[in-house]
């Protein structure tokens, strides 16, 4: 019962986490224009992994994709790679974990196989979560470095009469979504690994029983079974765990005068 709950909960938590990682990867607000201690501009700049956007005070938003691969910073490419690896591993982990769930019966699949699949998916979720956390952290570090560099530039080279507005970027919503989602996927993976231990049968201890024959004193140990190192069948009562997660993605479109795609 506890094993099923742990496995089911791990699956749901991981599902939410991976949905979050996907959402974070697709979001445009990885970095947003820093408004603190800056002139109030009538435009608001924000950037994602795939495109940069400008929202004007008029309400119109214009987004432009990064159409170059070679021209992009290596760090950005690395973050993209980490997030994609995280999503792929997470998606495979979800697929594997669906078949591993104790509440789902697939043919005559033994619990030993389910335990192995649960462990595999758990590890995949852990690695997926770590990839997402690493990706987001690398991007955050890049932002912090650039922020202080641009801050230094703001206070140097101001000798000329004409001032230039230095756009500084700070943490966007996607970073927080990514950190939380990565953490949830990681937690889900750990829960799956814990559930896997519960699915493995404990060593069956058979007490030696002495049978005294009328004429002989012979000690008889039944079976002489050796403790199996494999995963035996679990004869505990099974409770159906119905844990489903539903995610809805809302995409707001803005009016656009020109098509930049």
């Amino acid at each position: 019962m506890a094993v099923t709950a742990c496995q089911g909960l791990g699956f749901v938590v991981s599902l939410i986490g991976i949905a979050g990682i996907i959402a974070a990867t697709c979001m445009d607000q990885w970095s947003t224009q820093d408004l603190y201690n800056n002139p109030v501009t009538a435009v608001f700049n924000y950037q994602g992994l795939w495109r940069s956007c400008v929202r004007e005070s008029s309400g119109f938003t214009e987004c432009r994709g990064y159409f170059t691969l070679l021209g992009l910073p290596a760090m950005l490419q690395a973050v993209r790679a980490l997030m994609i690896v995280g999503i792929v591993l997470g998606a495979i982990g979800l697929l594997v974990s669906i078949f591993a769930l104790k509440c789902i019966r697939i043919g005559s699949m033994e619990d030993s196989a389910k335990a192995n699949m649960t462990l595999t998916s758990g590890i995949m979720f852990i690695v997926s979560g770590l990839c997402a956390i690493a990706g987001v952290s690398v991007f955050a570090n890049m932002l912090v470095t650039n922020f202080w560099m641009s801050t230094a530039n703001m206070y140097t080279g101001m000798g000329g009469m004409v001032q230039t507005v230095q756009t500084r970027y700070t943490f966007g919503a996607a970073l927080f979504v990514g950190w939380v989602a990565g953490g949830l996927t990681l937690i889900g993976g750990v829960m799956m690994c814990i559930a896997c231990r519960g699915l493995a049968p404990e060593e069956t201890n058979y007490k030696a029983v002495s049978y005294h024959a009328s004429g002989h004193s012979v000690a008889y140990k039944p079976g002489g079974f050796k403790a199996s190192t494999g995963f035996g069948s679990n004869t505990k009562n099974k409770k159906i765990y119905d844990g489903g997660a539903r995610t809805e993605d809302e995409v707001q479109s803005y009016p656009s005068k020109h098509d930049y795609v």
Epitope: Q33, P39, V40, T41, A42, V43, N45, Q47, S52, C53, V54, E56, S57, S58, G59, F60, E62, R64, V162, Q163, T164, V165, T167, P255, K257
Partner: antibody, heavy 117, light 113 residues
Framework: QVQLQESGPGLVKPSQTLSLTCTVS????????ISWVRQPAGKGLEWLGE???????NYNSALKSRVSISKDNSKSQVFLKLSSVQAADTARYYC???????????WGQGTLVTVSS | DIVMTQSPDSLTVSLGERATINCKSS????????????LTWYQQKPGQPPKLLIY???TRESGVPDRFTGSGSGTDFTLTISSLQAEDVAVYYC?????????FGPGTKLEIK
């Protein structure tokens, strides 16, 4: 078609509050921001402030303490209030629709406001 | 506040000739996010509200004749009328649409010689 029409009292006494209404048609205030601009006779244009689609506002710092802009989306109306008016506030007041590049693509005909006792 | 200056104050040009109006801002109007200059040009004829000619420093508003051209970047901008027509007699204003408050230039009065 897109239209903007300013309305309000043509004469306001000094130290009183000037209240103007901009009624729009042909578009929704939930999709477009509105800006207020004034022009004293024979002089240049002065930006007063704007109200965004979500209801947020930004005002000219020179008038910040005196100017207030609000709107009623259902009535397609935008309101300008300018308190403690003086003779220097005598001007033609325009409302305009914000478009690409934060430019004003449509303007009302303007309403002339005279501040005098 | 950004100070917008226009030159000349008034301009007299013959019909069919080229007219050039300059606008200078005290701060750059270039937005690094989209590499666009947030400067707008308006035309105002006597007794009428201003009319939008150019936005983003060089993008012509729909319906505006192609003899009107906007150029420039950063702090220096130019409005050019390639072949002056009688109906172009008006006052021309440039506007900062980048940093609040969104200030206007003092205007340039264009007349026919």
């Amino acid at each position: 078609q897109v239209q903007l029409q300013e309305s309000g009292p043509g004469l306001v006494k000094p130290s009183q509050t000037l209240s103007l209404t901009c009624t729009v048609s042909g578009f929704s205030l939930t999709s477009y921001a509105i800006s207020w601009v004034r022009q004293p006779a024979g002089k240049g244009l002065e930006w007063l402030g704007e109200i965004w689609t979500g209801g947020g506002t930004n005002y000219n710092s020179a008038l910040k303490s005196r100017v207030s802009i609000s709107k009623d989306n259902s009535k397609s109306q935008v309101f300008l209030k300018l308190s403690s008016v003086q003779a220097a506030d005598t001007a033609r007041y325009y409302c305009g629709r914000l478009s690409y590049g934060n430019s004003l693509d449509y303007w009302g005909q303007g309403t002339l406001v005279t501040v005098s006792s | 506040d950004i100070v917008m200056t226009q030159s000349p104050d008034s301009l007299t040009v013959s019909l069919g000739e080229r007219a050039t109006i300059n606008c200078k801002s005290s701060q750059s109007l270039l937005n690094s996010g989209n590499q666009k200059n947030y400067l707008t040009w308006y035309q105002q004829k006597p007794g009428q509200p201003p009319k939008l000619l150019i936005y983003w420093a060089s993008t012509r508003e729909s319906g505006v004749p192609d003899r009107f051209t906007g150029s420039g970047s950063g702090t220096d901008f130019t409005l050019t009328i390639s072949s002056l027509q009688a109906e172009d007699v008006a006052v021309y204003y440039c506007q900062n649409n980048f940093i609040y408050p969104l200030t206007f230039g003092p205007g340039t009065k264009l007349e026919i010689k």
